[in-house]
């Protein structure tokens, strides 16, 4: 039952906007709208893994605003209603359904700019986001599953003779935990109401020309190595050393 | 299969310590926390603390912080709960239960070992 | 501390009547447990993750909500469903696994 081995082919990119917080975006620049595009009439499905306390901004279909008829979010959040917010080109109106989270908002006026924004993503924002654009030329879809990730709190600790203790604290999704050199370990893990996992390894190394051991954490929102010396005196304890 | 074994009845004198044991078999001891339920007479659940049987950390509800001493044995894949001095609102059914798998909570529970605080 | 409040305290249904009881916490979360505890046995896992049956749970059962509000359904009540139920969570800042009051279910 150890935690699953993560994919770091979805190591998160993120730049900085207003000096203050990460932003990211799967967003094309309108350049980059394909003329063929109206052709492809199959949906398009990202899963996107966003950290907690950035911004992001999801996009529509790379469709030119002046071939629009209706734009319509829809956004399905665990154990809430679907909420749905619609803009109507032809009387330039806005329509929202059971949308209760004012951190997720229009970019600015849909008229202008049809991306959707969520300002300081929270775990509650984990769901699926899509973007519904009807044009004369039929209905283009662009859907988002959005994987909001929790960077862990690591901590390495030696409590007994010969055994070292790693823990990945509070992280989304669970971390892996492994070892350099490999000990006799016992991981466990533990899942929190609140959406986060702890990881926690314990290790014993019988073997005495083993002096210094390495907790390697894999995560999505980034990997960290730690080392510790072990010291031979019983009950000491020692914390770690961050590579 | 998984299974956590507890005595079925402790009597104890008002002020006397009592250690009531859990055995678990069936699976890695080592791999699990072990947690301590309470349950009063006609009342409801409350967590004790739990402790890590590979290198014996320990959480407490603060609330037993002073009344519950919890401890393991390895060998014997055992997990033990002491009190030191017992009163009568100590008289309840005492459930270990396990937790730090794929499911959330405690998945497995033991019987329960009703302790009976009289003179 | 999160604390969990559960209603009714006790109520009954007739066979075949749909059950809903609540679980409100004072503070927000994205998961909770129930437990389904009978007369002089161990507490059993009944529903976690909000909405997901344990093994063994008859699909009758479903578990609902988001936020600070939860319940738990039994859309057709049968009398094996006579027991206490309990909504439960685990938070790890600060560490503490808490339970409702329970909700102690009769058959008419």
């Known amino acids: 039952e150890g935690a699953a081995q993560p994919n770091n082919s979805l190591m998160l990119q993120t730049s900085k906007e207003n000096h203050a917080l990460a932003s990211s975006s799967l967003c094309m620049d309108e350049k980059q709208i394909t003329q063929n595009y109206s052709k492809v009439l199959a949906e398009v499905n990202t899963s996107w893994p966003v950290k907690m306390a950035t911004n992001a901004v999801l996009c529509c279909p790379p469709i030119a605003l002046r071939n629009l008829i209706i734009i319509t979010w829809e956004i399905i959040l665990r154990g809430q209603p679907s909420c749905t917010k619609a803009y109507k080109k032809e009387t330039n109106e806005t329509k929202e359904t059971n949308c209760t989270d004012e951190r997720i908002t229009w970019v600015s006026r849909p008229d202008q700019n049809s991306d959707l924004q969520i300002r300081t993503v929270a775990i509650t924002h984990d769901g699926y986001y899509r973007c519904i654009m009807v044009t004369p030329d039929g209905n283009f879809h662009r859907g988002y599953h959005l994987q909001v990730l929790v960077t862990p709190e690591v901590t390495l600790f030696q409590n007994r003779n010969r055994t070292a203790v790693c823990k990945a604290v509070a992280g989304k999704p669970a971390a892996h935990i492994s070892w350099i050199p490999e000990g006799d370990c016992a991981t466990k893990q533990e899942y929190w109401s609140n959406g986060t996992v702890t990881v926690k390894s314990t290790c014993h190394w019988e073997v005495h020309n083993v002096s210094t051991v390495t907790c390697h954490v894999s995560h999505l929102t980034g990997n960290k190595s730690l080392y510790i010396e072990l010291l031979p005196v019983p009950g000491a304890k020692k914390s770690a050393k961050l590579y | 299969q998984v299974q956590l074994q507890q005595p079925g009845a402790e009597f104890v004198k008002p002020g006397a310590p009592v250690k009531l044991s859990c055995k678990a078999s069936?699976?890695?001891?080592?791999?699990?926390?072990m947690n301590w339920v309470k349950q009063r007479p006609g009342r409801g659940l409350e967590w004790i603390g739990r402790?890590?049987?590979?290198?014996?950390?320990?959480h407490y509800n603060q609330k037993f912080k002073d009344k519950a001493t919890l401890t393991v044995d390895k060998s014997s894949s055992t997990a033990y709960i002491q009190f030191s001095s017992l009163t009568s609102e100590d008289s309840a059914v005492y459930y270990c239960?396990?937790?730090?798998?794929?499911?959330?909570?405690?998945?497995?529970w033991g019987q329960g070992t009703l302790v009976t605080v009289s003179a | 501390e999160n604390v969990l409040t559960q209603s009714p305290a006790i109520m009954s249904a007739s066979p075949g009547e749909k059950v809903t009881m609540t679980c409100s916490a004072s503070?927000?979360?994205?998961?909770m447990h129930w437990y389904q505890q009978k007369s002089s046995t161990s507490p059993k896992l009944w529903i976690y993750d909000t909405s997901k049956l344990a093994s063994g749970v008859p699909g009758r059962f479903s578990g609902s909500g988001s936020g600070n509000s939860y319940s738990l359904t039994i859309n057709s009540m049968e009398a094996e469903d006579v027991a206490t139920y309990y909504c439960f969570q685990g938070s790890g800042y600060p560490l503490m696994y808490t339970f409702g009051g329970g909700t102690k279910l009769e058959i008419k």
């Open positions: 503070s927000s979360l994205i998961y």
């Open positions: 069936g699976y890695t001891f080592t791999s699990y926390w």
């Open positions: 239960a396990r937790s730090g798998g794929w499911l959330p909570g405690f998945a497995y």
């Open positions: 402790i890590d049987p590979a290198d014996s950390e320990i």
